[in-house]
């Protein structure tokens, strides 16, 4: 014969545990029903009556099947540097994440405790590593032949335009200026910069010094981290 289905509350067999969505009440010594997400235990079970559940009040929640006497309070409203990506409901807590242009400098279990503005790279520097939800932008000096003339958390170093006749040479923070009579062309987007030695423009007129113990780059891509500033001493 199939075992009879027990209805809560019931006394468990010695050595066995209560079923899914049930809990063992120490006082009643019975298996009793848990309350569903969005509810809490208003009255605990006895030997003869099951748990009485009630809905969570405004600004409180329970996310799991539970037998807590009170629902949990939702977190405080999101700050001005945050956006609410999950509203406070009876079944879930409010989740605040950093708004665009910011990153999470101090996270909590869900969402972010402290947001900080993404670093902006000044002219002569470009974004080498973009910011993410949890990490800041990293800026690097623009490589010879590239420049950035903006203060931006997204702009990378761009290639100087190539002139038939250069009126003003470009540097790390300024594009080359061509003479108006000569036709110009820009380096194709996504073009690979020719491999650069680790020596920089400030060393081009002298023998290359002993190599740095820092790792060197073999190939430089316009999108990638860029080596040294060209013209950054404003010669």
């Amino acid at each position: 014969l199939p075992a009879q289905v027990a209805f809560t509350p019931y006394a468990p067999e010695p050595g066995s545990t209560c079923r899914l969505r049930e809990y063992y009440d120490q006082t009643a010594q019975m298996c009793c029903s848990k309350c569903s997400p969005g509810q809490h235990a208003k009255v605990f079970c006895t030997k003869t009556s099951d748990t009485v559940c009630d809905s969570c009040e405004d600004s409180t929640y329970t996310q799991l099947w539970n037998w807590v006497p009170e629902c949990l309070s939702c977190g405080s409203r999101c700050s001005s540097d945050q956006v609410e990506t999950q509203a406070c409901t009876r079944e879930q807590n409010r989740i605040c994440t950093c708004r665009p242009g910011w990153y999470c400098a101090l996270s909590k279990q869900e969402g972010c405790r402290l947001c900080a503005p993404l670093r902006k790279c000044r002219p002569g520097f470009g974004v080498a590593r973009p910011g993410t939800e949890t990490s800041d932008v990293v800026c690097k000096p623009c490589a010879p032949g590239t420049f950035s003339n903006t203060t931006s958390s997204t702009d990378i170093c761009r290639p100087h335009q190539i002139c038939n006749v250069v009126a003003i040479p470009g540097n790390a923070s300024m594009d080359a200026v061509c003479t108006s009579t000569s036709p110009t062309r820009s380096m194709a987007p996504g073009a690979v910069h020719l491999p650069q030695p680790v020596s920089t423009r400030s060393q081009h007129t002298q023998p290359t010094p002993e190599p740095s113990t820092a790792p060197s780059t073999s190939f430089l891509l316009p999108m990638g981290p860029s080596p040294p500033a060209e013209g950054s001493t404003g010669d």
């Epitope: 790279c121 000044r122 690097k140 113990t213 820092a214 790792p215 080596p227 040294p228 950054s232």
Partner: antibody, heavy 119, light 106 residues
Framework: QVQLVQSGAEVKKPGASVKVSCKAS????????IHWVRQAPGQGLEWMGW????????DYADKFKKRVTMTADTSISTAFMELSRLRSDDTAVYYC????????????WGQGTLVTVSS | DIQMTQSPSSLSASVGDRVTITCNGA??????LAWFQQKPGKAPKLLIY???SLQTGVPSRFSGSRSGTDFTLTISSLQPEDFATYFC????????FGGGTKLELK
């Protein structure tokens, strides 16, 4: 907290070289360039150059191009500045300072290293 | 390089005074000008960056402004700990410090 700790004072003879170190802690060393700035006794501040520890790339002030070499060892988060063919007017306190490439420039400095050049 | 002309080179003032120090850049340097404070035997300390922005932890009596190519550091009410040497620093087109202003107690 962010710290830049420099090597101790040096006394050198004219014509010799000196190598000053700057050990960084409290931040990601490769995310910042390191500037070197010097100050002769009773004088102002003079920018010498920078190094990007991530790639070893450098940029030097014209005045120092032929005599200075800046390097970095990322394994020990340390930047180095070597000045060769020393003269008496190189007697100065040499400082390192970090810079993240944002408008917030040189927000942390080493304590300085006095280099005395004397025969 | 862009030369930075700082004035005055020295200045005597009393506690409570309002003090201004000026730096002039011959060319346009955008707003990439910083001010540093240095006390004897100590490393410089960043006070203001990008002409106007106060570095974290710096008292609000320090402020920066500009008019054309003239950049100004103002200390609204001098405190005893403010007597030091101040340097401007441009970092838009290369890097260049001003000559410094020594602020002394009158």
């Amino acid at each position: 907290q962010v710290q830049l700790v420099q090597s101790g004072a040096e006394v050198k003879k004219p014509g010799a070289s000196v190598k000053v170190s700057c050990k960084a802690s409290g931040y990601t060393f490769t995310d910042y360039i390191i500037h070197w700035v010097r100050q002769a006794p009773g004088q102002g501040l003079e920018w010498m150059g920078w190094i990007d520890p991530d790639y070893g790339n450098t940029d030097y002030a014209d005045k120092f191009k032929k005599r200075v070499t800046m390097t970095a060892d990322t394994s020990i988060s340390t930047a180095f500045m070597e000045l060769s063919r020393l003269r008496s007017d190189d007697t100065a306190v040499y400082y390192c300072a970090r810079d993240d490439g944002s408008p917030l420039v040189m927000d942390a400095w080493g304590q300085g290293t006095l280099v005395t050049v004397s025969s | 390089d862009i030369q930075m002309t700082q004035s005055p080179s020295s200045l005597s003032a009393s506690v409570g005074d309002r003090v201004t120090i000026t730096c002039n850049g011959a060319q346009n340097i955008d707003n990439y000008l910083a001010w540093f404070q240095q006390k004897p035997g100590k490393a410089p300390k960043l006070l203001i960056y990008s002409t106007y922005s106060l570095q974290t932890g710096v008292p609000s009596r320090f402020s920066g402004s500009r008019s054309g190519t003239d950049f100004t550091l103002t200390i609204s009410s001098l405190q005893p700990e403010d007597f030091a040497t101040y340097f401007c620093f441009q970092y838009n087109n290369g890097y260049m410090f001003g000559g410094g202003t020594k602020l002394e107690l009158k």
